[in-house]
């Protein structure tokens, strides 16, 4: 608070203005000022046994202002309040309290809990997770064909984070086993996924080719007999899709 | 539990007076402001006269000043309301209520009605 | 005196319904104000104070916002008990003045 405060200069009588300082319109020798200039809030300040009057330009922490037509003034808060909005709704409580409704509390009531940053209670709110998303496609190491057994995950989101007294979140992700029919990899599918792919060095005039893992159930070559159309690779990889989500199983 | 009752409400003639008192008890009544508040039948809320905890200053809306005086006795914790040359437009229920900026708490009201 | 434009002066709404009534007010009143709810033959009771401070009592479906000159008053989800009328107040400084008063009534 700028407080502008007007203070007894001399020995003079009540309701003499000349040699008031500061924002005083009127003041005294023992009661310092009587009333204050416009705009300014009359406040008494409890200095040993009595009390002096000061001229604010706002009311100070503790107090609240009321502004009246003929004098604005300032009113204590109850004792364990910093700021009011009247003698009976606090709306800051002094330190080691806790708002509540206007209030200020040593403890939260049975159901609140005390917001030690804004020094409030307020409601416990306990963790919100959303529905399980989808399973993911049954894979191992990255890959969704070429082998057997896999894993399958599924994840859900945090719609509500838990207040410090609130309820901890249930896990967000689950994975189980998942058995899948043997499909050969495609072309496409091949490479490095999950661990470095294991590369021999090749032979005068040979390509350079990604070796499958010792692992791998099929060889991803392909001999002339065994392409197929375009329309029939469409259709099986259909029927393979179909096949991963009805035999897979939890272990 | 706090509780405001007001007495002395009726029915008058115009330019006559009538004497309004509000009794309250289950808060210090000698820490608050008291006030009155009028509604007229189907309007809003008026404020009609405000007199500080000690009894020292009171304050007037506009349509009753000069004719309406408020007062009140600590050692009874009574405010009244004293309405002289009461016109039509006085009609209304009357609401003692407790006054710190906000109105905090609110008796149930009396009705005066001023007819010829 | 501080103005008080209180709209709507009438609301139907239905159950369950979201609900918000404003108060303009001529000047700065910072948040020295207060809203007030009341039920047909009762007296006012106060809702709000300082601007978005619940009563103690007052259901958290009620909440109050604003500033300066701009305050709303917005009911989350109606209840039956909540039908009646409200009324805005500035507390800023003397005369206190009242806004006209909303009626909410089911639609």
């Known amino acids: 608070q700028n407080a502008s405060r007007g203070r007894r200069q001399r020995r003079m009588h009540p309701n003499v203005s000349q040699g008031c300082q500061g924002g005083c319109a009127t003041c005294s020798d023992y009661n310092g000022c009587l009333s204050c200039k416009p705009r300014l809030f009359f406040a008494l300040e409890r200095i040993g046994m009595k009390q002096i009057g000061v001229c604010l330009s706002s009311c100070p922490s503790g107090y609240y202002g009321t502004r009246y037509p003929d004098i604005n003034k300032c009113t204590k808060c109850k004792a364990d309040c910093d700021t009011c909005f009247n003698k009976n709704f606090c709306t800051k409580c002094k330190s080691g309290f806790y708002l509540h409704l206007g209030k200020c509390l040593d403890n939260c009531p049975e159901g609140l809990e005390a917001n030690n940053h804004t020094m409030e209670c307020v409601s416990i709110v306990h963790c919100e997770v959303s529905e399980w998303n989808p399973w993911s496609p049954c894979t191992k190491k990255g890959k969704t064909c070429g082998f057997k057994r896999g894993t399958e995950t599924r994840v859900r989101e945090i719609i509500q984070h838990p207040s410090a007294k609130g309820n901890l979140c249930p896990p967000t992700n689950e994975t189980r086993k998942c058995t899948v029919q043997r499909k050969k990899c495609q072309k496409g599918e091949r490479g490095k996924k999950g661990r470095e792919r294991k590369r021999k060095k090749p032979n005068k005039g040979e390509s350079k080719e990604a070796i499958p893992d010792s692992k791998s159930l099929e060889s991803s070559k392909e001999i002339p007999e065994q392409r197929e159309n375009k329309q029939q690779q469409k259709k099986r990889k259909v029927q393979d899709k179909q096949k991963s989500v009805s035999v897979s199983t939890v272990h | 539990e706090v509780q405001l009752v007001e007495s002395g409400g009726g029915v008058v003639q115009p330019g006559r007076s009538l004497r309004l008192s509000c009794a309250a008890s289950g808060f210090t009544f000698s820490d608050y402001d008291m006030a009155w508040v009028r509604q007229a039948p189907g309007k809003g809320l008026e404020w009609v006269a405000t007199i500080i905890y000690d009894g020292s200053r009171a304050y007037f809306g506009d349509s009753v000043r000069g004719r309406f005086t408020v007062s009140r006795d600590n050692s009874k914790n009574t405010l009244y309301l004293q309405m002289n040359s009461l016109r039509a437009e006085d009609t209304a229920v009357y609401y003692c209520t407790a006054h710190d900026r906000s109105f905090d708490y609110w008796g149930q009201g009396t009705m005066v009605t001023v007819s010829s | 005196d501080i103005q008080m434009t209180q709209s709507p002066s009438s609301l139907s709404a239905s159950v369950g319904d979201r609900v918000t009534i404003t108060c303009l007010v001529s000047?700065?009143?910072?948040?020295?104000f207060v809203w007030y709810q009341q039920k047909p033959g009762k007296a006012p009771k106060l809702l709000i104070y300082a601007a978005s401070r619940l009563q103690d009592g007052v259901p958290s479906r009620f909440s109050g916002s604003g500033s300066g000159t701009d305050f709303t008053l917005t009911i989350s989800s109606l209840q039956p008990e909540d039908f009646a009328t409200y009324y805005c107040q500035q507390s800023y400084k003397y005369p206190p003045t009242f806004g006209q008063g909303t009626k909410l009534e089911i639609k």
């Open positions: 000047e700065d009143i910072s948040n020295d």
